[in-house]
């Protein structure tokens, strides 16, 4: 569904822009502390990232601009949840599973930050 | 901990080799079906991948060679679990969280398969 793909990409780009624009507003609370993963394997930490976003949302005075930002982040979360559903939907033959496992291991080997 | 990093890379490489070598043994069960994610965002599907490995392990007659393969996969799983623990260990300032969030969104934008 290329349209949906294009829409998500646009949404992420817009969110990055809003994040840049409203940094000062967002980091207003100097005492607030939020969980930040200690590594760069972002996809492993989806839950914690969105918990952090919720903490930020609850601690920030909402203006219209920030409302759009948090709304975008919520839509991104919905998309990710859909992707997570697709992890277990398809039951395939052992051959296909082995091909996927081989690829997964290659990804760990080349792309993951595996220190520590 | 570069030593540990090097060890994991070696472990993953050895596992890939074992997987290639023992494909025929592994795919013996023609009727067995295993969940295969419908997309390439592997890190979102860790749980399902290792559930699939367990299914395969329980359905396969264990020889010494296969024992090593499944042992390796179990060690890789342990490492990933350690990484997952590190998602929520560090409580940092908003500034650092925003930096991480920005990086996460950039990764979605450039690296994820976000079709459909």
């Amino acid at each position: 569904i290329p349209k949906q793909s294009a829409t998500l990409r646009a949404l992420v780009r817009e969110t990055l822009t809003l994040l840049s624009t409203h940094r000062t507003l967002l980091k207003g609370n100097e005492t607030l502390r939020i969980s930040v993963p200690a590594h760069k394997n972002h996809q492993l930490c989806i839950e914690e990232i969105f918990q952090g976003i919720d903490t930020l949302k609850n601690q920030t005075t909402q203006g219209e601009a920030l409302a759009t930002l948090f709304q975008n982040l919520s839509l991104i979360k919905k998309h990710i949840d859909l992707q997570k559903q697709k992890c277990g939907e398809e039951r395939r033959r052992v051959k296909q599973f082995l091909d996927y496992l081989q690829e997964f291991l290659a990804v760990i080997n080349t792309e993951w930050t595996i220190e520590g | 901990i570069p030593k540990q990093s090097a060890t994991l890379r070696a472990l993953v490489r050895e596992t890939l080799t074992l997987l290639s070598t023992h494909r025929t043994l592994l795919k013996g069960n023609e009727t067995l079906r295993i969940s295969v994610p419908a997309h390439k965002n592997h890190q979102l599907c860790i749980e399902e991948i290792f559930q699939g490995i367990d299914t395969l392990k329980n359905q396969t007659t264990q020889g010494e060679a296969l024992a090593t393969l499944f042992q390796n996969l179990s060690l890789i799983k342990k490492h990933i679990d350690l990484q997952k623990q590190k998602c929520g260990e560090e409580r940092r300032r908003v500034k650092q969280f925003l930096d991480y969030l920005q990086e996460f969104l950039a990764v979605i934008n450039t690296e994820w398969t976000i079709e459909g």
């Epitope: 398809e90 039951r91 395939r92 033959r93 051959k95 296909q96 091909d99 996927y100 081989q102 690829e103 290659a106 990804v107 | 079906r33 295969v36 994610p37 419908a38 997309h39 390439k40 690296e111 398969t113 079709e115 459909g116």
Partner: antibody, heavy 119, light 107 residues
Framework: QVQLVQSGAEVKKPGASVKVSCKAS????????INWVRQAPGQGLEWIGY????????RYNQKFKGRATLTVDKSTSTAYMELSSLRSEDTAVYYC????????????WGQGTLVTVSS | DIQMTQSPSSLSASVGDRVTITCKAS??????LSWIQQKPGKAPKTLIH???RLIDGVPSRFSGSGSGQDFTLTISSLQPEDFATYYC?????????FGQGTKVEIK
């Protein structure tokens, strides 16, 4: 938009080899498998194999194993299908097709490349 | 290898007719079947995947059904642009295999 553009028609002698290219654009090349399918004149479709551009892992239809070689060049987002020891019955249109997900349906097809094997 | 048997191999129909093509797999392929349309001299085009899921942009007059071994493609009201050859494809197991095709001609 997502596109697969194949190389032009080829005429080859029996015993020779042919290498057909398939250039991908409009998406992240390493995120989707590329399948190869052929169609002899007036005949149906036949699957040759697939390659995963992420890790170069390929899988072949036993019928073509040893004669077909699937490769990719990630730097140019191009997939290749080489067929060796050509015989007249290899005369066909060769298509590349993108896999939508993992071992999923073919959502985008190349325009096809006619390979003629004739002495 | 899984054999895919398609029937009929050809049929003649008029615009507005309801057309049904069937495909039988030699073993259980779950729902991993797609229907492909090909017009003369053109590249194939996938219409339906996972047995009954219509691909974006494909007219709703096309529908698919079935699971296991028996599958059906239905065109509810044949249009002039639907005259083509239709193939089923199983992508449940390697090697992927196609049906021999059904040519839909104008009566």
């Amino acid at each position: 938009q997502v596109q697969l553009v194949q190389s032009g028609a080829e005429v080859k002698k029996p015993g020779a080899s042919v290498k057909v290219s398939c250039k991908a654009s409009g998406y992240t090349f390493t995120n989707h498998h590329i399948n190869w399918v052929r169609q002899a004149p007036g005949q149906g479709l036949e699957w040759i194999g697939y390659i995963n551009p992420y890790n170069d892992y390929s899988r072949y239809n036993q019928k073509f194993k040893g004669r077909a070689t699937l490769t990719v060049d990630k730097s140019t987002s191009t997939a290749y299908m080489e067929l060796s020891s050509l015989r007249s019955e290899d005369t066909a249109v060769y298509y590349c097709a993108r896999d939508y997900g993992n071992f999923w349906y073919f959502d985008v097809w190349g325009q096809g490349t006619l390979v003629t094997v004739s002495s | 290898d899984i054999q895919m048997t398609q029937s009929p191999s050809s049929l003649s129909a008029s615009v507005g007719d309801r057309v049904t093509i069937t495909c039988k797999a030699s073993q259980d392929i779950n729902s991993y079947l797609s229907w492909i349309q090909q017009k003369p001299g053109k590249a194939p085009k996938t219409l339906i995947h996972r047995a009954d899921r219509l691909i974006d942009g494909v007219p709703s007059r096309f529908s698919g059904s079935g699971s296991g071994q028996d599958f059906t493609l239905t065109i509810s009201s044949l249009q002039p642009e639907d005259f083509a050859t239709y193939y089923c494809l199983q992508y449940d197991d390697f090697p992927y295999t196609f049906g021999q095709g059904t040519k839909v001609e104008i009566k």
